[in-house]
Interface confidence: medium
């Protein structure tokens, strides 16, 4: 499905279902009353029981491109987050103190993400070729780490998933994560003519020019994110079910599980040729700029039950549900969003010609 041609005064769309059925998990048991191993107890953890976590370096993928951000005043968000494995960033949360620029000064930058996309104002850029993905079809083994990091659900990807934005601009995938809303409330990060979609997937990549995330942060083109909107459709999405069926396993903040490998490309739209492109930032602290964003025009369809499961299965810090984990859209500040395809003529009689006021700037892309 393509992005809707919406009028400026269109009400925001919702995508969650009202279903109360729990997510049925065929593949893994859920944590109805999970018998877990306890870490050495700390006062702040009791009486909760946490799973053992693997030790990692000081800078973790979940500290960086999980790509979320502060709350929209019109979308109250309640998800305080502090990564218990040791955040690289100071404490931050959606929709509350501290202001993100205090957490990371880059969050006050001029070229931040997400943004509102207005297709009619995008610059058609024929040089934007279909994306090329290599190695995204993963075998079942080895298993992958799926983690509730308190502000999203994140799948850590193995080496070997390669993506090219163009000749000589190669990237490897690091992780993917989702953004969502709540029952009756959409939760995508990017919007299209003000329309917020039920959810959004981000696949975060690092340029092959850099060996480590720290080196790529803030460098132009150092990181690249593929983004797609998730919408409600009539059928279950079997690719997403391979992740969603494990959510009850990681209901608690900080918990993780192992999931079989899957075809990561199946989580993205089938049409990789029609997309919007702009330069922005990570959407959570550290909000590093220079991130190349690719937002697909085609949406991905999930069933109402799947969208409901996504928005209702996880918990953030304390007793708060992990919901509405998106950042308010940021001003373009003169940036031009490019499109790999010409804007379509509206079906309404008054729209005779596509109105594209901007020209393609990145001819060599």
């Amino acid at each position: 499905q393509r992005l809707p041609r919406m009028q400026e005064d269109s009400p925001l769309g919702g995508g969650s279902s009202g279903e109360d059925d729990p997510l049925h998990e065929e593949d893994l048991p859920s944590e109805e009353d999970p018998p877990r191993e306890e870490d050495p107890p700390r006062e702040e953890d009791l009486p909760e029981v946490k799973p053992k976590s693997e030790e990692e370096g000081s800078l973790k993928l979940e500290d960086l491109p999980t790509v979320e951000a502060p709350g929209d005043p019109q979308e109250p968000q309640n998800n305080a987050h502090r990564d218990k494995e040791g955040d690289n960033q100071r404490h931050w949360r959606y929709g509350g103190d501290p202001p993100w620029p205090q957490v990371s000064p880059a969050c006050a930058g001029r070229f931040q993400s997400p943004v509102d996309i207005r297709p009619q104002l995008a610059a058609f850029c024929p040089a934007l070729r279909p994306l090329e993905l290599l190695g995204f079809e993963l075998p079942l083994l080895p298993e992958l780490r799926l983690r509730n990091n308190g502000h999203s659900v994140q799948l850590t990807l193995p080496s070997g998933l390669e993506m090219a934005l163009g000749p000589g601009r190669e990237y490897r995938a690091l992780q993917l994560h989702l953004h969502w809303g709540a029952v009756g409330r959409p939760g995508s990060e990017h919007t299209v003519e003000g329309h917020r979609f039920p959810a959004e997937i981000h696949v975060v990549h690092i340029s092959t020019a850099y060996a480590r995330v720290e080196e790529a942060l803030g460098r132009p083109g150092g990181l690249a994110v593929l983004a797609a909107f998730l919408e409600e459709g009539p059928e279950e999405n079997s690719a997403y079910e391979q992740l969603l069926s494990h959510l009850e396993e990681i209901a608690e903040e900080g918990s993780e599980t192992q999931v079989p490998g899957l075809d990561v490309s199946a989580l993205l739209p089938s049409d990789l040729s029609r997309y919007f492109r702009y330069e922005g930032s990570l959407t959570t602290p550290p909000c590093a700029q220079g991130v190349i964003w690719t937002v697909f025009n085609q949406t991905v369809m999930l069933s109402a039950k799947q969208l409901h499961a996504l928005s209702d299965a996880l918990w953030g810090p304390g007793d708060s549900r992990l919901q509405l984990n998106f950042r308010v859209t940021q001003p373009l500040n003169g940036r031009v969003i490019e499109a790999s395809f010409p804007a379509e003529v509206d079906s309404s009689p008054r729209a005779a010609e596509p109105v594209q006021l901007n020209s393609c700037l990145a001819a060599g892309d």
Epitope: E25, D27, P142, E143
Partner: antibody
């Protein structure tokens, strides 16, 4: 072919401890989640404990929580079950079993090792 | 925890006849159900997973059906080598739980 061989069972007094081992071969051990399942004499099967492929996620049955500890050494292709504060109700054949890579059934089982708790 | 109840406790079937074993869950387990065969003195062997999918090298005479709370294992033509105890197991919610077993023998 896939092989799971348990060892470490024996006779132990109530309150005592035992450490069971399971040696795995014929597959990439570090890629599979594992469980211990036990069977009391003449009884049915009872799941005891689970450990994910990396060891990052662990579960226990309520009946053994706080007394048993599951662990694995992927470098040695070995699974372990440390059993403390044993009681007569823990007398059973203990099987180590491999979880399927995708669905969560147990596709390969060892032949079991017998643990007898008696004074 | 989810309680799995198998019936009958013992099933005697004539050679070549069909054996039908039932397993009921105390609450829905979707299709997160497996069947195992355990012969005397041996370890259990996986027959069926996801309620109806035969495991590797399991002959077609074994079939599974059902979802939610009611499940059935069918042995289409019972032979002497099928004499065993059959267990169902749910893996939809922790803790993993097994049924009490159905002992199948030859009439």
């Amino acid at each position: 072919q896939v092989q799971l061989v348990e060892s470490g069972g024996g006779l132990v007094q109530p309150g005592g401890s035992l450490r069971l081992s399971c040696a795995a071969s014929g597959f990439t051990f570090s890629s599979y989640s594992m469980s211990w399942v036990r069977q009391a004499p003449g009884k049915g099967l009872e799941w005891v404990s689970y450990i994910s492929s990396s060891g990052s996620t662990i579960y226990y049955a309520d009946s053994v929580k706080g007394r048993f500890t599951i662990s694995r050494d992927n470098a040695k292709n070995s699974l372990y079950l440390q059993m403390n504060s044993l009681g007569a109700e823990d007398t059973a054949v203990y099987y180590c079993a491999r979880h399927r890579s995708y669905r969560f059934a147990l596709d390969y089982w060892g032949q079991g090792t017998t643990v007898t708790v008696s004074s | 925890e989810i309680v799995m109840t198998q019936s009958p406790a013992t099933l005697s079937v004539s050679p070549g006849e069909r054996a039908t074993l039932s397993c009921r869950a105390s609450q829905s387990v979707s299709r997160g159900l497996a069947w195992y065969q355990q012969k005397p003195g041996q370890a259990p062997r996986l027959l069926i997973y996801s309620a109806s999918t035969r495991a590797t090298d399991i002959p077609a005479k074994f079939s599974g059906s059902g979802s939610g709370t009611e499940f059935t294992l069918t042995i289409s033509s019972l032979q002497s080598e099928d004499v065993a105890v059959y267990y169902c197991q749910q893996y939809n919610k922790w803790p993993l739980t097994f049924g009490g077993g159905t002992k199948v023998d030859i009439k």
